[in-house]
């Protein structure tokens, strides 16, 4: 059976201040090394502890960076890619792709490029909603009779 | 998950030369970062070298520099450490080291904290 994964993708700015010890994660990716398959983008494998970026907490191991001070890093070396991290300065801007696993289930694994992945809380919470409403208004009908 | 097996240590003249290999699993081997340290008695362990995944860039401590050789064999999972010139201060145990990808900071920042996998150590004594 196919597990079905739903994903809530959300973009974020991050600024980050260089500590002492540099901004604190490491990288995977590029076009010459990549690491998630059908995908030369450059994301985040680790984050050191009590680094730059462990101590601000937005930035997540698996995050996806799409830009660096304004600079899109499609396309680029994995080297290419560490010297523009290496170089960015005392005060960096990511821009990061953040994906939440939203639920898993027994349907047929649909690509993260399909537009009908709609992450399964945006249903269920309207359908709750809306039973909530209709149960209160079934009280109310009752009370009235 | 990486495991790494250190190997080259031994007993060598003040002046000589001896080559480390360390020889890792793991599939993905050109994903991770390398590096050596050593601890001499008494000391922290300290860093000496490392290697990018690609092999395309490299980092050595000011004490080593000139004189040690950080390469990589990613056909054969190993990467080696050349050092020449050998001083009685050189002797220590010498560790390699793995963690996965590319750290965003340049060398001179390295310590133990920046990697997750290590080997069991080789001693290397200069006399």
């Known amino acids: 059976m196919n597990g079905r994964v739903d994903y809530l993708v959300t973009e974020e700015e991050i600024n980050l201040t260089r500590g002492p010890s540099g901004l604190g994660f490491n990288i995977v990716g590029g076009t010459d090394q990549q690491y998630v398959s059908n995908d030369s983008g450059i994301y985040v494998s680790r984050i050191k502890e009590n680094g730059a970026a462990a101590l601000d907490g937005r930035l997540q191991e698996g995050d996806k960076i799409l830009s660096v001070n304004g600079q899109d890093l499609k396309n680029l070396l994995h080297q290419d890619a560490v010297d523009l991290f290496r170089n960015a300065g005392y005060a960096v801007s990511l821009r990061v792709q953040h994906r939440l696993q939203v639920q898993n289930g027994p349907i047929g694994h649909r690509g993260e490029g399909d537009p009908s992945g709609i992450p399964i809380f945006m249903v269920l919470v309207p359908v709750f909603a809306l039973t909530m409403v209709a149960a209160w208004a079934f009280m109310r009908y009752r009370q009235q009779l | 998950q990486v495991q790494l097996v250190e190997s080259g240590g031994g007993l060598v003249q003040a002046g000589g030369s001896l080559r480390l290999s360390c020889a890792a699993s793991g599939r993905t081997f050109s994903s991770y970062t390398m590096g050596w340290f050593h601890q001499a008695p008494g000391k922290e362990c300290e860093f000496v070298a490392e290697?990018?995944?690609?092999?395309?860039?490299?980092g050595y401590a000011d004490s080593v520099k000139g004189r040690f050789t950080i390469s990589r064999d990613n056909a054969k999972n190993t990467v080696y450490l050349q050092m020449n010139s050998l001083k009685p201060e050189d002797t220590a145990v010498y560790y390699c080291a793995a963690v996965i990808g590319s750290p965003t900071d340049s060398s001179d920042y390295r310590s133990s904290l920046d990697y997750d996998y290590w080997g069991q150590g080789t001693q290397v004594t200069v006399s």
């Open positions: 290697i990018s995944g690609t092999g395309g860039n490299t």
